[in-house]
Interface confidence: medium
């Protein structure tokens, strides 16, 4: 008789990424008997929750349950019922909630409390909702991409998983851009990490890693735009802000109260003689870049070297995976190819920003205007952040790989978070057994 495989013995896990601009739910799956192997966990589903980030529900917490319903119901459908009770659910909130907590711990707790109560109503094994630190966000992103790239595996493969993967075991650095914060995480080359807050030590699969990480709160793309507007309106002669980061012909009215709502603009706050102002786009990449550079204070550094705002940064080392908004923005702009040099990216940005708004709307008719209008700023901000903020150069640009997914799983902090909380990354290299992982009868 023919050998027949036993029914698959799999496990599932759910992580909700409660970001500043939206929430996404990820479902992961792995073979139960291979839990400690590297690279066996993969993403089977991503569900984007309709609506803004959870921090925006501060005045309407009663709507949080409905907000989460669709994606939680989707998880119910995807995961077999027999597995529901043993499927862990984790929610991690990032910089949007960190900012809310800075304003009011009480309000942040109230939002998280309602989120927890809503998620507890589902038949899964809910493990809690919490605001993760910027350091965790950076570290888990780094773990995710290196786990998916097979960098923690001791068995050097003769084949390559992805085009930019080298067969060596040198880890990739992680560059993560969100709406409210951005993270840089990598293993420096024989370099002392001068600031203890930026140093992490891991032992993974029998190998020690000394990792540098920092999360820049308020330097995600959305908060950076608010910062830039608050900075520029200070010197505007009236309620018209001629802005080089928006396309020529673009107009938008902004409430001053909205501008000063976020803690990120506090340093630029001043009494203005108007309640509203109008952004008028002039579409000039070079001027936009110059304006963005004013957000980075590079004149103060209490260490041997800094990124900006007095934050220690060792010399860059190795290849980097740039994901989340780094990828989404560059993908939209068609600039993720390995062959596109930094000079080419700059040239394309100059052309893109200079295109009239009416022309842009016609060319990208399917894209929401709110998002469409901000790609010139976001693309320019990415270049400014990588070049002036993190000190990549035109030459080292080739070491940046814009990554959306690796082997079908999204690059981001959520997978690393789940791997850690489910103890699926052992400190020591698992002993290989002489038996095959597949059992046949």
């Amino acid at each position: 008789t023919q050998n027949k495989a036993l029914p698959e013995n799999v496990k599932y896990g759910i992580v909700l990424d409660a970001g500043s601009s939206h929430t996404s739910l990820y479902i992961y799956k792995w073979p139960a008997e291979k839990e400690n192997d590297t690279g066996v966990v993969h993403q089977v589903e991503e569900c984007r929750v309709k609506g803004p980030g959870i921090s925006k529900f501060v005045q309407k917490v009663n709507e949080i349950g409905i907000y989460l319903t669709d994606c939680m119901e989707r998880a119910r459908e995807v995961i077999p019922r027999s597995q529901h009770q043993e499927t862990p659910v984790y929610l991690g909130a990032t910089a949007g909630m960190r900012l809310l907590r800075m304003e009011s711990e009480e309000l942040a707790d109230r939002v998280l409390d309602v989120v927890e109560r809503s998620l507890s109503n589902y038949p899964f094994d809910f493990q809690g909702a919490r605001i993760i630190t910027g350091q965790e966000e950076g570290a888990y992103g780094w773990i995710t991409i290196n786990y998916l790239l097979g960098k923690f595996s001791q068995k050097t493969r003769w084949f390559s998983i992805v085009p930019y993967e080298t067969n060596n075991q040198e880890t990739f650095g992680a560059l993560d851009l969100g709406g409210a914060s951005t993270q840089v995480t990598f293993v420096p080359q024989n370099q002392t990490i001068e600031s203890p807050d930026n140093a992490l030590q891991f032992r993974l699969y029998g190998k020690d890693y000394n990792v540098y990480t920092h999360s820049f709160l308020c330097y995600g793309k959305d908060q950076a735009l608010w910062q830039k507007l608050a900075k520029d309106i200070q010197v505007a002669s009236n309620e018209i802000l001629r802005d080089p980061c928006f396309h020529p012909g673009y107009k938008k009215v902004v409430n001053v109260s909205d501008l000063y709502k976020t803690p990120c603009t506090k340093r630029f706050e001043m009494t203005l003689p108007f309640q509203q102002f109008e952004i008028q786009g002039i579409g000039n990449y070079q001027q936009c870049h110059q304006s963005i550079l004013e957000l980075f204070n590079t004149s103060y550094c209490p260490y041997s070297q800094c990124a900006f705002n007095g934050i220690f940064l060792p010399p860059l080392q190795g290849d980097f995976g740039a994901f989340s908004a780094f990828y989404f923005v560059m993908k939209f702009l068609n600039l993720t190819s390995e062959k596109v040099s930094q000079e080419k990216v700059t040239e394309m940005m100059k052309k893109f920003c200079a295109q009239p708004w009416e022309e842009i709307k016609t060319s990208y008719a399917g894209v929401k205007e709110k998002y469409l209008s901000e790609y010139c700023f976001s693309g320019t901000y990415i270049l400014s952040l990588l070049l002036q903020g993190y000190h990549f150069t035109a030459d080292s640009w080739e070491h940046i790989h814009f990554i959306g997914k690796i082997q079908g799983s999204d690059a981001g902090w959520t997978l690393g978070y789940m791997l850690n909380l489910t103890n699926m990354i052992p400190a020591e290299q698992p002993l290989s057994t002489p038996l095959s992982h597949s059992t046949y009868v």
């Epitope: 550079l293 590079t298 860059l316 035109a394 030459d395």
Partner: antibody, heavy 123, light 108 residues
Framework: QVQLQQSGPELVKPGASVRISCKAS????????VHWVKQRPGQGLEWIGW????????KYNEKFKAKATLTADKSSSTGYMQLSRLTSEDSAVYFC????????????????WGQGTSVTVSS | EIVLTQSPAFMAASPGEKVTITCSVS???????LHWYQQKSETSPKPWIY???NLASGVPVRFSGSGSGTSYSLTISSMEAEDAATYYC?????????FGSGTKLEIK
């Protein structure tokens, strides 16, 4: 110790070509850029371009793209610059200099220079 | 290209005098990308100050550098005869790499 030893002075005719060399010692040749810089008599410094011997990538100042060709020989740790279609405007002292490659430093500065090679274009 | 404008083009200072040379950059650059070189006649340039304010090996502590954005300077707290030379600022923020036109400093 680190040294960049350049070839001797050259007297060449207009329209001809010249190749000058820069022999590196005291460091890992493939771990640094080799730059070339021009200085006309009594004038300032002008960057021509660099070559990275590790992967022989080159970067040129657009102004010198049609004039200079940079090469490197890893086996002898030597960088070369060929100047073609020479005119009196090319009469100058040419320096080679090294600077650290990505991942080795935070500051990209030309930390060691050759002694310079004088090129005189005259009929 | 990024233009670096040095001033003054020439100056003479007495021994013990404080000297400041400025370098104005046409675009905002990161301070880590602004360097100074010293060149004496008939010799090759020497790295003098890197990343705006870090003294290269062997440079006397009477030299200092400062600045950010588009405005940078090199200062000698007390001029000495051996400081007579031409000083160049240089940027590596964008291509092509560019140098200032130089400041020739003489001893009175």
């Amino acid at each position: 110790q680190v040294q960049l030893q350049q070839s001797g002075p050259e007297l060449v005719k207009p329209g001809a070509s010249v190749r000058i060399s820069c022999k590196a010692s005291g460091y890992t040749f493939t771990g640094y850029y080799v730059h070339w810089v021009k200085q006309r008599p009594g004038q300032g410094l002008e960057w021509i371009g660099w070559i990275y011997p590790g992967n022989v990538n080159t970067k040129y100042n657009e102004k010198f793209k049609a004039k200079a060709t940079l090469t490197a020989d890893k086996s002898s740790s030597t960088g070369y610059m060929q100047l073609s279609r020479l005119t009196s405007e090319d009469s100058a002292v040419y320096f080679c200099a090294r600077s650290p490659y990505y991942g080795t430093t935070y500051y990209y500065t030309m930390d060691y220079w050759g002694q310079g090679t004088s090129v005189t274009v005259s009929s | 290209e990024i233009v670096l404008t040095q001033s003054p083009a020439f100056m003479a200072a007495s021994p013990g005098e404080k000297v400041t040379i400025t370098c104005s950059v046409s675009l905002i650059i990161s301070s880590r990308n602004l360097h100074w070189y010293q060149q004496k006649s008939e010799t090759s340039p020497k790295p003098w100050i890197y990343g705006t304010s870090n003294l290269a090996s062997g440079v006397p502590v009477r030299f200092s550098g400062s600045g950010s954005g588009t405005s940078y300077s090199l200062t000698i707290s007390s001029m000495e005869a051996e400081d007579a030379a031409t000083y160049y600022c240089q940027q590596w923020s964008d291509y092509p790499l560019t140098f200032g036109s130089g400041t020739k400093l003489e001893i009175k």
